[in-house]
């Protein structure tokens, strides 16, 4: 049996076109071999009419083509201007005509019946515009023009050239009479409703000599496109409603009971609370198309979504719409990760971000979701060594633990860091995840001096006090830079006296810088980890100055507040800068986020995935 498949019977009428799709197993050999369409002769041969190698029979010249789609394992034969002579038995196949890798197709072309009652069929999508053309003869050029709709047995006047408009069509219909040269008038109906479908009659003149033309208007409700996405993953709805609604407010809504469609997000600034922190409506293109990204998908997000355009920013009768049926797969490939991470003012958080482990070489990013306007997510850090200026010294993206997870550490927390953050890569866009950072009451667990000044050529010792709760953790010091935090040698100096009610298991671990140079200036972190999993960190800025008096410096906690020094942050840190990423393709499939990094100087980023899974800031 041949592995080629296609339609066994194709029926059409004279003058029409057909598109015959033939399916083949998309092996490497099949993808590249010759494709053909041939007509079977009475004696069993098969005469090639068209092939993928450029041959076209004179019978098909100018009216047929063959297109191969190797990625789908299909090729399509289009034949136009059919005549009854085209009726017959054909084969679509691969390789050589006589070799059997083919499929038999019967094509039957009947005589065209012409349109019954001279009826013109108009098939138009819901919310769009139809133009019904009505020809007339010269003798009726000066007479009344009208359009009727057949309701049951009776024609009901819809519009006429004397100015009448049926109330059901007010504000969305017009009658145009072409210039004197053309014997034609047109009726244009906008914002088509399902109820507009039916039989129409246009008429020029009112007596027995009037010209009449029948029209059948079919209004199509869009079939939902089926979308299957993983729990905790991400979905993008691409909405292209056409340039005629480019300047009309756009919306995405989710159908609830009956005909209700609850707005999820719109361009007028509305956003459903359930989507706070995990939705972006990307700016629309000139042609009116836009896209909506939802991350942190939940079971309850499944359902029917409509995007549309209406001045109210919500679904109304006559809105042009597109539809999707979203299914959320609970057997998700995206691992569970905390959706809420808690930290204290002055403390830190370590956020675990999942990514598709097949894409270990992809660039990783972390951005802060902002709800203003339609939502956006300016980048804060990436895995290629870029960190947003306001976050220098307190934010790091680490490739560890790897194998499908990376880590983001943010310290020197303030209440302004509370919000929703997104983890993403320039690879699989379905793996965007969200996490909410909450700032709670409490003191940081690690105690370090606030700021430290070292003297050129001298030795500096910086203490970090670890409470006993971290006794089983690895303790480290490192020097922060844009690409991470490079580990430094440190000394365990025994139990710390910085904690009340903490036994011998508390620890004082010092960083020692010998013969300080200008290169030693910068941010230093002390922290705890277990293997490749990071816990709390604390940051100290070390300034370097000229020698004033001899000796080494030993910094104690008493010399500085336990809270981190915040002067590195701009006073304008909270303002949303206008350079945040606004490229609509940023969160679409086509464009790597990296391309827009230089635009990413907006504020910080955030994300909600709304479940109750929570992670404290101090440990995993």
């Amino acid at each position: 049996k041949s592995p080629i498949f296609g339609p066994e019977e194709v029926n059409s009428v004279e003058g029409n076109s057909v598109s015959i799709t033939c399916y083949y197993p998309p092996t490497s050999v099949n993808r590249h071999t010759r494709k053909y369409w041939c007509r079977q002769g009475a004696r069993g041969g098969c005469i090639t009419l068209i092939s993928s190698e450029g041959y076209v029979s004179s019978k098909y010249a100018g009216r047929a083509n063959l297109t191969n789609f190797p990625e789908n394992g299909t090729f399509v034969v289009n034949i136009a201007q059919l005549s009854q002579d085209d009726s017959g038995r054909y084969k679509c196949g691969l390789g050589i005509n006589s070799r059997g890798l083919s499929f038999d197709v019967s094509l039957e072309v009947s005589q065209g019946p012409g349109l019954l009652n001279d009826t013109k069929v108009y098939t138009v999508d819901l919310g769009r515009t139809v133009t019904i053309n009505c020809p007339f003869k010269t003798e009726n050029a000066q007479k009344r023009k009208s359009l009727y709709k057949q309701i049951g047995l009776y024609p009901v006047l819809v519009i006429d050239s004397s100015g009448y408009v049926n109330p059901n069509y007010t504000g969305r219909i017009r009658l145009d009479i072409q210039g004197t040269g053309q014997l034609l008038f047109s009726v244009v109906i906008n914002q088509l409703r399902l109820s507009d479908a039916g039989q129409y009659l246009c008429q020029a003149g009112d007596d027995s000599n009037s010209n009449k033309k029948n029209a059948d208007l079919q209004v199509l409700k869009p079939e939902p496109e089926l979308v299957y996405e993983d729990l905790r993953g991400s979905v993008t709805f691409h909405c292209a409603l056409g340039p005629e609604v480019a300047n009309v407010a756009k919306f995405l809504c989710r159908q609830s009971s009956g005909e209700n469609c609850d707005v999820v997000v719109n361009t007028l600034g509305k956003r459903a609370p359930a989507f706070e922190g995990r939705i972006l409506l990307n700016p629309q293109d000139k042609d009116g198309s836009f896209s909506v990204v939802i991350t942190g998908l939940r079971k309850e997000d499944a359902g029917r979504y409509l995007c549309g355009a209406h001045s109210d920013g919500q679904l109304q009768e006559g809105s042009p719409i597109q539809a999707w049926q979203l299914f959320v797969n609970e057997e998700s490939t995206i691992p569970r990760s905390p959706t809420v991470v808690k930290g204290v003012a002055g403390g830190s958080v370590a956020v675990l971000c999942p990514y598709n482990r097949k894409e270990s070489k992809s660039i990783k990013y972390w951005c802060l979701w902002e709800g203003a306007q339609n939502g956006r997510c300016p980048l804060l850090v990436d895995s290629e060594g870029w960190v947003k200026a306001q976050y220098e010294g307190r934010l790091s993206l680490l490739e560890e633990p790897g194998n499908g997870t990376f880590t983001v550490i943010l310290n020197q927390l303030t209440s302004r860091d509370a919000g929703f953050y997104w983890c993403l890569t320039n690879g699989d866009t379905l793996w965007r995840t969200t996490v909410e950072i909450k700032i709670i009451e409490g003191e940081p667990n690690l105690k370090v001096p606030g700021n430290v000044t070292a003297v050129l050529g001298e030795t500096l010792k910086v203490p970090c006090h670890f409470p006993c709760k971290f006794s089983s953790y690895e303790k480290y010091w490192c020097k922060w830079n844009n690409t991470g935090c490079q580990a430094l040698p440190s000394q365990d100096e025994g139990p710390s006296k910085a904690f009340v009610n903490c036994d011998e298991n508390s620890r004082l671990v010092s960083l020692t810088l010998n013969l300080v140079t200008r290169a030693d200036e910068g941010w230093y972190w002390c922290g705890v980890k277990q293997g490749h999993f990071y816990g709390e960190t604390a940051a100290v800025y070390v300034a370097v100055e000229e020698r004033k008096a001899a000796g080494s410096r030993d910094v104690s906690l008493a010399k500085a507040d336990a809270a981190p020094d915040e002067k590195v942050l701009d006073s304008g840190f909270r303002e949303i800068e206008n350079k945040a990423i606004q490229d609509p393709r940023l969160f679409a499939e086509e464009k790597a986020v990296a391309d827009t990094r230089d635009q990413a100087d907006g504020s910080r980023a955030s994300v909600d995935s709304g479940s109750s899974e929570e992670q404290g800031g101090s440990s995993r």
Partner: nanobody
Framework: EVQLVESGGGLVQAGGSLRLSCAAS??????????MGWFRQAPGKEREFVSA???????????YYADSMKGRLTISRDNAKNTVYLQMNSLKPEDTAVYYC???????????????????WGQGTQVTVSS
């Protein structure tokens, strides 16, 4: 929402014939804008493609049949009644299965044998062929 209701199943002797019907309702679109077809599922087996009928417009349509039943099937439809029919001849015991009517509004852009591409499924009608 499109509803599909199958009928015409039953018990038949090997070599006999059956005509299955599937009535569609509930759509704002014209019936010819849908691809309609049939799948079947025998006990303990996967659902498999039987036949499909796709309309490109009011006068152009394409009929597809499964290799396993080639020459024994005829699919047709009555657009006025919004009904699709499957005439099955020379039935064999291995044709015993639940036959499902399917529909999709996707048009011609996919392999009609791919069951994932059908948005609407009927409840199914049992066909039993005794030897």
């Amino acid at each position: 929402e499109v509803q599909l209701v199958e009928s015409g199943g039953g018990l038949v002797q090997a070599g006999g014939s059956l005509r299955l019907s599937c009535a569609a309702s509930g759509s704002g679109r014209t019936f010819t804008s849908y691809t309609m077809g049939w799948f079947r599922q025998a006990p303990g087996k996967e659902r498999e493609f039987v036949s499909a009928l796709t309309w490109a417009d009011d006068s152009t349509y394409y009929k597809y049949y499964a290799d396993s039943m080639k020459g024994r099937l005829t699919i047709s439809r009555d657009n006025a009644k919004n009904t699709v029919y499957l005439q099955m001849n020379s039935l064999k015991p291995e044709d015993t299965a639940v036959y499902y009517c399917v529909a999709t509004g996707r048009g011609l852009t996919y392999d009609p044998r791919d069951r994932r591409k059908y948005d609407y499924w009927g409840q199914g009608t049992q066909v039993t062929v005794s030897s």
